[in-house]
Interface confidence: medium
């Protein structure tokens, strides 16, 4: 088991060395500006964010080919959720530094959960998206 | 208030069979997935099986698959074991659990424990 | 053995705080829960911590749990004598499609 398990650590590392999950990333992004856009901020207004998506992207047009784009890379993690819930943490890790504040995060980790359903995939069971936990409360 | 009461343990002989029953009360069991737990005396916790909320999908230990079956009637609210080929190893405490797993990222817990029942497996 | 590791016994005073280890692998740990349960003796064990960090009602804040990466940490502070008792940690493993419970932890409240 421990050199099947081995083999298995190695397939899913290759798989996620060669998969480009930036378009995943752009499109949460875009969707949780989009999201935050409708309740009532300007979405001309100048962004910091390096994935800050112009006002053509902001009408769905360009989140619509990063969501293409997006799950084509997803789908070469169909046949392995162990795989996939590694590669949905990876989208996570990449993004939380740049995620302002807890809501922010909560919006965009709400999405992620989302995103293997959004492209007709099963989402991996009992994946763990929290980055660094640390002791909360449940209530 | 929740409550979980296993009967059906006992003495067996190597070779035999038995099965244990747990009574549920106080929850809406068909929205839970449900969970067998064992402890060998003075050893730690050891899971058994798991079964979801309809009964679909079921996962057991290595050394009890084939043996064990994990069963649920949730108009009578009750979890079943049914244990064949029972050995010497298979005997401990075994528990009735309640498992808190909900959706795809989210985790198993136990948070509701039955007082378990005994399971003595000798010649 | 148990896959998930933690140390078979610690010891403090009260008052003090203490940490309970427990280490696994990117298959169980790395990807998945962790809880944590509180064994006094001769009775079923409880529920102290679930989904890495949180408490069920009725359990005080003096226990909190923390994860980072592949292992996990249940913290108690303000040790009592009444938290003498075997603490066992648990995840589930992806690859062996099973929950592994850890091997255990006796503490002793001197």
């Known amino acids: 088991r421990q050199q099947w398990e081995l083999q298995g650590d190695r397939r899913c590392q290759s798989q996620l060395e060669r998969a480009n999950l930036r378009p995943c990333e752009q499109h949460l992004m875009q969707k949780i500006q989009r999201d935050e856009d409708s309740y009532g901020r300007d979405p001309y207004s100048p962004s910091q964010d390096p994935y800050s998506p112009s006002p053509y992207d902001r009408r769905g047009a360009g989140s619509s080919q990063h969501q293409e784009r997006c799950c084509n890379e997803l789908n070469e993690f169909e046949n392995n959720q162990r795989c996939m819930c590694e590669a949905l943490q990876q989208i996570m890790e990449n993004q939380s530094d740049r995620l302002q504040g807890r809501q922010q995060e909560q919006q965009f980790k709400r999405e992620l959960r989302n995103l293997p359903q959004q492209c007709g995939l099963r989402a991996p069971q009992r994946c763990d998206l929290e980055v660094e936990s640390g002791g909360r409360d449940r209530y | 208030e929740v409550q979980l009461v296993e009967s059906g343990g006992g003495l067996v002989q190597p070779g035999g069979s038995l099965r244990l029953s747990c009574a549920a009360s106080g929850f809406k069991f068909s929205t839970f997935y449900m969970t067998w737990i064992r402890q060998a005396p003075g050893k730690g916790l050891e899971w058994v099986a798991n079964?979801?909320?309809?009964?679909?999908?079921?996962d057991y230990l290595d050394s009890v698959r084939g043996r064990f079956t994990i069963s649920r009637d949730n108009a009578k609210s009750s979890l079943y074991l049914q244990m064949n080929s029972l050995r010497a190893e298979d005997t401990a405490v075994y528990y009735c659990?309640?498992?808190?797993?909900?959706?795809?990222?989210?985790?198993?817990?136990?948070?509701?424990w039955g007082q378990g029942t005994l399971v003595t497996v000798s010649s | 053995q148990s896959v998930l590791t933690q140390p078979p016994s610690i010891s403090a005073a009260p008052g003090q705080k203490v940490t309970i280890s427990c280490s696994g692998t990117?298959?169980?740990?790395?990807?998945?829960?962790v809880s944590w349960y509180q064994q006094l003796p001769r009775t079923a064990p409880r529920l102290l911590i679930f989904?890495?960090?949180k408490r069920p009602s009725g359990i005080p804040d003096r226990f909190s749990g923390s994860k980072s990466g592949s292992s996990a940490t249940l913290g108690i502070t303000g040790l009592q004598t009444g938290d003498e008792a075997h603490y066992f940690c648990?995840?589930?493993?992806?690859?062996?499609?099973?929950?592994?419970f850890g091997g255990g932890t006796k503490l002793t409240v001197l």
């Open positions: 990117g298959s169980n740990i790395g990807h998945n829960y």
């Open positions: 079964i979801k909320q309809d009964g679909s999908e079921k």
């Open positions: 659990t309640r498992n808190g797993l909900q959706d795809s990222y989210s985790g198993d817990f136990f948070d509701h």
């Open positions: 989904d890495n960090t």
């Open positions: 648990a995840t589930w493993d992806a690859d062996l499609s099973a929950v592994l």
